[in-house]
Interface confidence: low
């Protein structure tokens, strides 16, 4: 029977800068029941606080609701593991909410084949930003990436769309069924998961008339 091993805070994510969650990996349990507590203080403060919500984020997590989240300050946090034989502490982690945003995937992905007269046909892709993100405040710049591939192909073709919420793709294989997905990231943050795939059948007469 030993004191617990050193825990590690391995991930913190925020969907929208308004709330965030951090997760830790327990160290070895030393063969005894082990309690974990996360404590933190904000930059410019000396007061230590305990995690406000150990439930919402699931096991080994701490969730910071709106009233505990400030994007103006760095959070300095650590996890304490305690059993009957002693305690151990994780390394301090510095968390800036601005830099841990991982939005939900974009919504309302729509894909359409356009064949304008006397022009090259193209695939027109359109989407909406995730609901939780408020772009009007100017606090967020969302960047988008599209991926698509023929249904049976192994490789994805990636296109970077910048801040646009629509995109045109010209070079496609006629007669193929394509999968299309889109994802987004804040200007400094993490890519969202890919949106659910949308399927589109490319007509056989999708020809390139130069």
């Amino acid at each position: 029977q030993l004191p617990p091993g050193k825990p590690e805070i391995f991930k913190c994510r925020s969907p929208n800068k308004e709330t965030f969650t951090c997760w830790w990996r327990p160290g070895t349990d030393g063969g005894l029941p082990t309690n974990y507590s996360l404590t933190y203080h904000r930059e410019g403060e000396t007061l230590m606080h305990e995690c406000p919500d150990y439930i919402t984020g699931g096991p080994n997590s701490c969730h910071f609701g709106k009233q505990y989240t400030s994007m103006w300050r760095t959070y300095i946090m650590m996890v304490n593991a305690t059993n009957q034989m002693g305690s151990s502490f994780s390394d301090e982690l510095y968390v800036d909410v601005t830099y841990i945003v991982q939005p939900d995937p974009p919504l309302e992905l729509a894909v359409e084949v356009k064949q304008p007269e006397d022009r090259k046909p193209y695939l027109w892709i359109k989407w909406s930003p995730p609901t939780l993100i408020d772009l009007k405040t100017g606090w967020f710049t969302l960047l988008y990436e599209i991926r698509l591939k023929p249904e049976k192909a192994a490789e994805w073709e990636i296109h970077f769309a910048g801040q646009q919420t629509e995109f045109k793709i010209l070079s496609l294989h006629p007669g193929q069924k394509y999968l299309v997905q889109v994802r987004c990231k804040p200007d400094h943050g993490y890519w969202s998961a890919w949106s659910p795939a949308t399927f589109i059948q490319i007509p056989s007469d999708f020809t390139m008339n130069d």
Epitope: E43, G44, M71, T74, I76, D187, H188
Partner: antibody
Framework: EVQLLESGGGLVQPGGSLRLSCAAS????????NHWVRQAPGKGLEWVSD????????NYADSVKGRFTISRDNSKNTLYLQMNSLRAEDTAVYYC???????????WGQGTLVTVTS | QSVLTQPPSASGTPGQRVTISCTGS?????????VHWYQQLPGTAPKLLIY???VRPSGVPDRFSGSKSGTSASLAISGLRSEDEADYYC???????????FGGGTKLTVL
């Protein structure tokens, strides 16, 4: 070696404008907050403004709000202070400073003198 | 009004211990914000001397120490030396101003 080098100071008439620059070297500029702090001749330090790493957030002292604009170009490792509607009381040495975790100012430039007089 | 108040001057003889106070209010030091101290030698830019109330950056002699209690902070210099003659400023974030506050500065003279 961390270096901050201010430029752009000089003599200007009341109501005029100046743009100060601060060239940074010796560290990853985009990883730090940055500040402007000024010091009137024979007086103490007065914080003017700060800006976050990716320019998402800016703060200003009440005395300059609406007249001064802080900005940065991370590709050029340069901090700026656009000063409009200058007044005699803006006369000071202007320092740029690097901000660390609690945004404390850990390195300072040598300053550039701005003189506002008619 | 938010201010950090420091005595305008302080003095001591070589080898003595000198303390400089910095008094704030409930919107800055008393709110829980940490205090930083800067040293400005004549004709030079300020230099970070103490941060987060009592931490010395590398290269700062252990003759310099800081403390904080309630709405006040203090800087102590022991074993005073002639090269310590300088202006000393405290600084803290102020919640009501949403900005940094510097104390008025204390001119330290080594007699």
């Amino acid at each position: 070696e961390v270096q901050l080098l201010e430029s752009g100071g000089g003599l200007v008439q009341p109501g005029g404008s100046l743009r100060l620059s601060c060239a940074a070297s010796g560290f990853t500029f985009s990883s730090y907050w940055n500040h402007w702090v000024r010091q009137a001749p024979g007086k103490g330090l007065e914080w003017v403004s700060d800006i976050s790493r990716a320019s998402s957030y800016t703060n200003y002292a009440d005395s300059v709000k609406g007249r001064f604009t802080i900005s940065r170009d991370n590709s050029k490792n340069t901090l700026y202070l656009q000063m409009n509607s200058l007044r005699a009381e803006d006369t000071a040495v202007y320092y740029c400073a690097r901000g660390l975790d609690a945004r404390r100012m850990d390195y300072w430039g040598q300053g550039t003198l701005v003189t506002v007089t008619s | 009004q938010s201010v950090l108040t420091q005595p305008p001057s302080a003095s001591g003889t070589p080898g003595q211990r000198v303390t400089i106070s910095c008094t704030g209010s409930s919107s800055n030091i008393g709110y829980g914000y940490v205090v930083h101290w800067y040293q400005q030698l004549p004709g030079t830019a300020p230099k970070l001397l103490i941060y987060r109330n009592n931490v010395r950056p590398s290269g700062v002699p252990d003759r310099f120490s800081g403390s904080k209690s309630g709405t006040s902070a203090s800087l102590a210099i022991s074993g005073l030396r002639s090269e310590d003659e300088a202006d000393y400023y405290c600084a803290a974030w102020d919640d009501s101003l949403n900005g940094w506050l510097f104390g008025g500065g204390t001119k330290l003279t080594v007699l």
